[in-house]
Amino acid sequence: FLFHYSKTQKLGKSNVVSSVVHPLLQLVPHLHERRMKRFRVDEEFQSPFASQSRGYFLFRPRNGRR
């Protein structure tokens, strides 16, 4: 009864796969992490803009700090 699936979510003009997790799966965080890794291959990188896509790690440091 523990299951995990992915769905494509429209973000601006970019399609990026997000994950939907069954509430019971949240009780087993390590299992959740392992399953998340399996689903990373479903990620899409459509829009080239960081500001339009959750596929990016959005970098927003200020004053040159990293």
């Epitope: 970019s14 990188f45 080239p48 803009f49 500001s51 339009q52 790690f57 959005l58």
Partner: antibody, heavy 117, light 107 residues
Framework: QIQLVQSGPELKKPGETVKISCKAS????????MNWMKQAPGKGLKWMGW????????TYSEEFKGRFAFSLETSASTAYLQINNLKNEDTATYFC??????????WGKGTSVTVSS | DIQMTQSPSSLSASLGERVSLTCRAS??????LNWIQQEPDGTIKRLIY???TLDSGVPKRFSGSRSGSDYFLTISSLESEDFVDYYC?????????FGAGTKLELK
């Protein structure tokens, strides 16, 4: 390995149409957007726009709205750039470039288009 | 549109020399900046993404850094194949914009 193979050079007359292809291999074509860039002789690079390879929706930069059209042949993992009613100022090398996690990551080798009467 | 002001436009340097190229962004782009290299035959390769991360296969003599709105590409010790053109590219927001380029020439 990831490759974007572009079609060969084109010599056209003003008013004609050209269609450039960009064949992708080494990855799932529909999971990465495709961008198009223009580089006039001796000049820098300009982004023309991009096409969503999943939905087929094109987005054009302001400067390239009107005579320019992006399209796909998904079954052949190929993106196309068509330029209608060619003008002398379209003489340039055109590049396709794949969207990756951080902006564009892989580039085609470019297709030279010469417009001359 | 975000303007990327790249300098110098050309640079003469010697083998083994250390050089730095600069791009200044007209507005905040965070670390959403790449550096690309263009060879004389037109071939383009990304060297650095997200300001400071080297692409795989890129020699360690290349590095990227940032101070405020200034972004730097540094080559620690020039080799013969480095004398080509370099561009910065911001991918923060639409439209994608490039610096005007730097031509690196052998002195």
């Amino acid at each position: 390995q990831i490759q974007l193979v572009q079609s060969g050079p084109e010599l056209k007359k003003p008013g004609e149409t050209v269609k450039i292809s960009c064949k992708a291999s080494g990855y799932t074509f529909t999971k990465h957007g495709m961008n198009w860039m223009k580089q006039a002789p001796g000049k820098g690079l300009k982004w023309m726009g991009w096409i969503n390879t999943n939905t087929g929706e094109p987005t054009y930069s302001e400067e390239f709205k009107g005579r320019f059209a992006f399209s796909l042949e998904t079954s052949a993992s190929t993106a196309y750039l068509q330029i209608n009613n060619l003008k002398n100022e379209d003489t340039a090398t055109y590049f396709c470039a794949r969207t990756g996690r951080y902006g564009v990551d892989y580039w085609g080798k470019g297709t030279s288009v010469t417009v001359s009467s | 549109d975000i303007q990327m002001t790249q300098s110098p436009s050309s640079l003469s340097a010697s083998l083994g020399e250390r050089v730095s190229l600069t791009c200044r962004a007209s507005q905040d782009i965070g670390s959403n900046l790449n550096w690309i290299q263009q060879e004389p035959d037109g071939t383009i390769k990304r060297l650095i993404y997200a300001t400071s991360t080297l692409d795989s296969g890129v020699p360690k003599r290349f590095s990227g850094s940032r101070s405020g709105s200034d972004y730097f590409l540094t080559i620690s010790s020039l080799e013969s194949e480095d004398f080509v053109d370099y561009y910065c590219l911001q991918f923060d927001s639409s439209p994608l914009t490039f610096g005007a380029g730097t031509k690196l020439e052998l002195k």
